[in-house]
């Protein structure tokens, strides 16, 4: 099985024990590590941060001691913006220039492939996204002709039904991608006005349309029905939680909220907590399991957080094995307890290790 793990370059800027550099990563933990994100500038792939090349080096040095590890560079992301991707993909010359710029950049910096993180193609971009993937793959095939190992091509796709329908020709893009990471998280957010788990495995008992689509099981099944081969589908598992501020004394699933949860000490983003911050939060919190959805949530005071723990990730891995998927994807290594100092287990990357162990189990 593949264990595809994302590393985010901005994690370097977190304070103190939250700061994560690629040389802190475990070289034997994942089969693939994806560096997020690269930029596109002047129609050429480029670094996002000025110091990215230093981090590329740190990451790719991990392969010196584990030659089986593959690294990919992810281009795009939320801050890149869909419009910029759209302009490049829809213009033949811009698209060609971008595609041509990718192999030398990846080779120079020691990457084994490219991950496309166009978040998200609009309805009018659907065909252009397919063309971009098809032409990128053709370039990779051509570039590898002189006996080089062919560069890998993957894409991170939304797990939301509405976005899947408008953005992707799943059957066509699947032909050209080496694997597809389906982002089976962020199904529920503060915009709903109520508490809810952002990455449930199954549909909740109370879920009616459109909530019945907002779970991992539906998204995976839908992708498979649309023509994604199970052998290329990698299922996303988050090492972060989504938090809410409760608006009343109600604390269960569906309780009213006044907004996102308070920011974490290190990640400093309202409504989001890294797993290592959740471990801190759990001291003195009340933990519940949403039985049908097979995921936990915790409450403390007026704070509510839905997250994944070692038990829920094992359930998710068993699910993906039952569906004969290619493996699991983790967002993100730097949100797991990468130092092993927060979650009281004396184990670095406890969630990702639990995923790895579950994948390896017979």
């Amino acid at each position: 099985y593949k264990l595809v793990c994302y590393y985010t370059s901005w994690s370097q800027y977190r304070e103190g024990d939250g700061s994560c550099f690629p040389d802190a990563l475990d070289r034997f933990l994942c089969t693939h590590i994806i560096y997020s994100f690269a930029n596109i500038s002047n129609d050429h792939i480029d670094t996002w941060e000025w110091n990215d090349v230093t981090l590329y080096g740190m990451l790719n040095t991990l392969k010196n001691r584990n030659p089986n590890l593959k690294t990919l560079l992810s281009v795009g992301g939320w801050n890149f913006g869909s419009q910029r991707f759209s302009k490049i993909a829809s213009n033949t010359q811009s698209r060609r220039t971008f595609i041509k710029s990718v192999p030398p950049f990846l080779r120079t910096h020691g990457f084994d492939g490219l991950d496309l993180a166009w978040l998200y193609p609009g309805r009018r971009d659907k065909q252009h996204f397919t063309t971009l993937i098809k032409e990128m793959k053709a370039e990779f095939i051509k570039e590898a002709q002189p006996g080089k190992k062919q560069l890998l091509l993957s894409a991170a796709l939304s797990a939301g039904k509405v976005t899947i329908d408008s953005s992707y020709d799943i059957a066509k893009i699947s032909q050209h991608l080496d694997f597809i990471s389906i982002m089976t998280y962020d199904f529920h957010g503060a915009w709903r006005g109520t508490t809810g788990h952002h990455s449930p495995l199954f549909r909740g008992q109370e879920d009616a349309s459109p909530d019945r689509f907002s779970n991992t099981d539906y998204a995976v099944g839908y992708m498979l029905r649309l023509g994604a081969p199970a052998s290329k589908l990698v299922m996303g598992i988050p090492t972060f939680g989504r938090s809410f501020t409760l608006a009343s004394s109600e604390t269960g699933v569906g309780a009213p909220i006044s907004g996102p949860g308070i920011p974490g000490r290190f990640t400093k983003e309202a409504g989001t907590l890294a797993y290592y911050e959740i471990c801190d939060f759990l001291r003195g919190a009340t933990v519940h399991r949403i039985l049908g959805q097979q995921v936990p949530y915790a409450t403390k005071g007026n704070q509510w957080v839905g997250y994944d723990d070692q038990e829920s990730v094992k359930s998710k891995v068993q699910y993906l094995k039952d569906r004969q998927l290619a493996g699991a994807m983790v967002w993100a290594l730097d949100l797991d307890d990468f130092q092993g100092s927060f979650c009281g287990q004396d184990l670095r990357f406890p969630l990702t290790n639990a995923i790895k162990d579950a994948l390896a189990a017979t």
Epitope: Y13, S41, H44, D46, T47, T54, M58, T108
Partner: antibody, heavy 117, light 107 residues
Amino acid sequence: EVQLVESGGGLAQPGGSLRLSCAASGFTFSSYAMHWVRQAPGKGLEWVSSIKSSGGSKNYADSVKGRFTISRDNSKNTLYLQMNSLRAEDTAVYYCAKGYGASFDFWGQGTLVTVSS
Amino acid sequence: DIQMTQSPSSLSASVGDRVTITCRASQDISSWLNWYQQKPGKAPKLLIYAASRLQSGVPSRFSGSGSGTDFTLTISSLQPEDFATYYCQQAYSFPWTFGQGTKVEIK
């Protein structure tokens, strides 16, 4: 072997112009950010300007902003520094440096710019 | 702008000595500090990047440590070829700035 060779230095009048060039070889020039760093006689190092690999992002020290322009031609493996409105305090050895992220891992031998009337 | 202050500005040492140079940033720069060595009439050479990572080809007697505002370059056993001027450089935010340099001379 990485090589960076600066040229274009010399004597210039205050208010005058010079264009420095840096010919690069031994690495994939188009995949790296490039930089200019200067050193006044007997003084320390001062970062001057940087340009990303695509040429799409440029930064300048306040002391040269609006007067100096960094550019690159990836097809020629060459970095440039156009220096206008030169001042006596711009007198220095100008080094071209290859970027290893936000550090400078290879440097040219430098070219001396003297601004004097 | 972030100010970088090196100390001492010069020092005299003998071959085999352990030498320590410090660099202080005027604000938190995480681990984004680089160290360079420069010999008279020559271009600088990168020794340490990102506070503690040894640049390829640099002898292991050189080491760097620190994060936040306080950083150290250590030469565990000074060799004749190590007599030079050493500069720190912050790479956290523009404008990138250098320390004023530390000259290591023969005692």
